[in-house]
């Protein structure tokens, strides 16, 4: 028994950043006379948040009237709440010392935990395009979340990725917290449509989960297949050469037509199907006038995909040939390309 | 049961120091302050000083000079000494517990005399 | 130092009827949204007893016929009705202010 105990009912509370926190404390006594304060934290650094005798706390206010006659509820209201305010609060009586008020009781404190919700969760991946069969990272952030208890997944296309690196920073004791998680994919020819998610659990949330998405169509970069064939023409001077250019992504493609080795045309890929997969095709078509030429015609297509190395494949054209024959297809140059 | 018990001479010759024991029962000196408060002869009553649960003192300005209040707590005794004392020193000397001065001893008297 | 001037320095009141005492505090003995004034009562060759603390409530123990009341400097302690057992000295005491000082006591006798 003391002849003044400042109780603190409440050992912790927990309120949603944005919200109101309710302090609690009563006195046993009003004798002697001197002022309640309220600090965050212990010691000779311990921060004011509330004093009875004096100053301005426009985010505190009193839950009972202090100027009442026997009021001995000394509990507070801290509003619009944020990670920062985390801590542990103590309710002070103070004595009218002299010359200056003396601290006579604290109660045991309250700690105050404050619940903040992560921020929305942002997906990047690489900053250059790969190719299928590469394995690309994506990483994954986000902020500002309390307490530091986090789950976070990876998905691809609805199914959950395992190759995956989370750290939560910082490891010890803060007002909030951060996330940052780095995957690993392996890109395959049918990802142009494919979606890469991270999801985010947080007690805040209520089973509700945040999720940041990336697609793989800024990722991926899906090389053409080439294919020269030759078609007979009415005019039987005439011989249509075609380059199908074949499941390619993104769009960006400019072909060149050589005739012995000579750039007879380019062209620039406008009008291309789009394949169920999300990957393009295109076709580009050569007319040759054979009785221009003695010899035989060496025809190549080249194509220039996203900015990489050409790849090309050549048709021999026959001159001596009947124009309805076909002649032999070469293998095709890939020069450079990065299949996987 | 609260209780509160004044002892020590009753007589005190003039530039002595006064010293009196308050001894408590009932309630704990770290949880208390323990007021010495008294009476001359026919008059009012003067509030000399309290130590507070703490050990921490305040005294009356007036006495300021000559009072010191002290306590062993493991022996439940709060002390009083008063140096250099005259006949107007001479009352009866009361202890009484806390701020709010709710349980008061029976009181002592000091004579201060040669 | 706060000065507590008492009125009347005597009184003497039939059983049954009421006594009001008056303390005067030469500055204000209001802190916090109280007043820090007490009363206490004394019988001859006893120590002061409470009777009142924070200018208006009651002690434990002690009968509602007593009452107080006040704020600021001017406060009053009641004894209604009065009774036999009343007479004894009685005394306001502040302490709000560094010294504690006592009122010089009013005496009520009864009839």
């Known amino acids: 028994e003391e002849e003044l105990q400042v109780i603190q009912p409440d050992k912790s509370v927990l309120v949603a950043a944005g919200e109101t926190a309710t302090l609690r404390c009563t006195a046993t006594s009003l004798i002697p006379v001197g002022p309640i304060q309220w600090f965050r934290g212990a010691g000779p650094g311990r921060e004011l948040i509330y004093n009875q005798k004096e100053g301005h706390f426009p985010r505190v206010t009193t839950v009972s009237d202090l100027t009442k006659r026997n009021n001995m509820d000394f509990s507070i209201r801290i509003g619009n709440i944020t990670p920062a305010d985390a801590g542990t609060y103590y309710c002070v009586k103070f004595r009218k010392g002299s010359p200056d008020d003396v601290e006579f009781k604290s109660g045991a404190g309250t700690e105050l935990s404050v619940r903040a919700k992560p921020s929305a969760p942002v997906v990047s991946g690489p900053a250059a395009r790969a190719t299928p069969q590469h394995t690309v990272s994506f990483t994954c952030e986000s902020h500002g979340f309390s307490p530091r208890d986090i789950t976070l997944k990876w998905f691809k296309n609805g199914n959950e990725l395992s190759d995956f690196q989370t750290n939560v920073d910082p490891v010890g004791e803060s007002v909030s917290y951060s996330i940052h998680s780095t995957a690993k994919v392996v890109l395959t020819r049918e990802d142009v449509h494919s979606q890469v998610i991270c999801e985010v659990a947080h007690v805040t949330l209520q089973g509700d989960p945040l999720r940041g998405t990336a697609n793989l169509s800024e990722t991926i970069r899906v090389p053409p297949t080439l294919e020269v064939t030759q078609q007979p023409v009415r005019a039987e001077n005439q011989v249509n050469v075609t380059c199908q250019v074949r499941k390619f992504y993104p769009q960006r493609l400019q072909l060149t037509w050589l005739e012995n080795g000579n750039v007879s045309r380019t062209e620039t890929a406008s009008t291309v199907t789009e394949n169920k997969d999300g990957t393009y095709n295109w076709m580009s078509w050569l007319l040759v006038n054979v009785s221009a030429h003695r010899d035989d015609v060496k025809l190549t297509c080249q194509v220039e995909h996203d900015g990489q190395p050409a790849v090309s494949k050549s048709h021999d054209l026959k001159v001596s040939a009947h124009p309805k024959e076909q002649g032999s297809n070469t293998a095709a140059e890939n020069t450079g390309s990065n299949e996987r | 049961q609260v209780q509160l018990q004044e002892s020590g001479p009753g007589l005190v010759k003039p530039s002595q120091t006064l010293s009196l024991t308050c001894t408590v029962s009932?309630?704990?000196?770290?949880?208390?302050?323990v007021n010495w408060i008294r009476q001359p002869p026919g008059k009012g009553l003067e509030w000399i000083g309290i130590?507070?649960?703490?050990?921490?003192?305040d005294y009356n300005s007036a006495l300021k000079s000559r009072v010191t209040i002290s306590k062993d707590t493991s022996k439940n005794q709060v002390f009083l000494k008063l140096s250099s004392v005259t006949a107007a020193d001479t009352a009866v000397y009361y202890c009484a517990r806390a701020g709010k001065m709710d349980y008061w001893g029976q009181g002592t008297t000091v004579t201060v005399s040669s | 130092d706060i000065v507590l001037t008492q009125s009347p320095a005597s009184l003497a009141v039939s059983p049954g009827q009421r006594a009001t005492i008056t303390c005067r505090a030469s500055?204000?003995?209001?802190?916090?949204?109280?007043?820090?004034m007490h009363w206490y009562q004394q019988k001859p060759g006893q120590p002061p007893k409470p009777l009142i603390y924070?200018?208006?409530n009651l002690e434990s123990g002690v009968p509602a016929r007593f009452s107080g009341s006040g704020s600021g400097t001017d406060f009053t302690l009641t004894i209604n009705p009065v009774e036999a057992n009343d007479a004894a000295n009685y005394y306001c005491q502040q302490n709000n202010e560094y010294p504690w000082t006592f009122g010089g006591g009013t005496k009520v006798e009864i009839k």
């Open positions: 500055e204000s003995v209001d802190s916090y949204g109280n007043s820090f």
């Open positions: 924070l200018a208006s």
């Open positions: 009932g309630f704990s000196l770290t949880g208390y302050g």
């Open positions: 130590i507070w649960g703490d050990g921490s003192t």
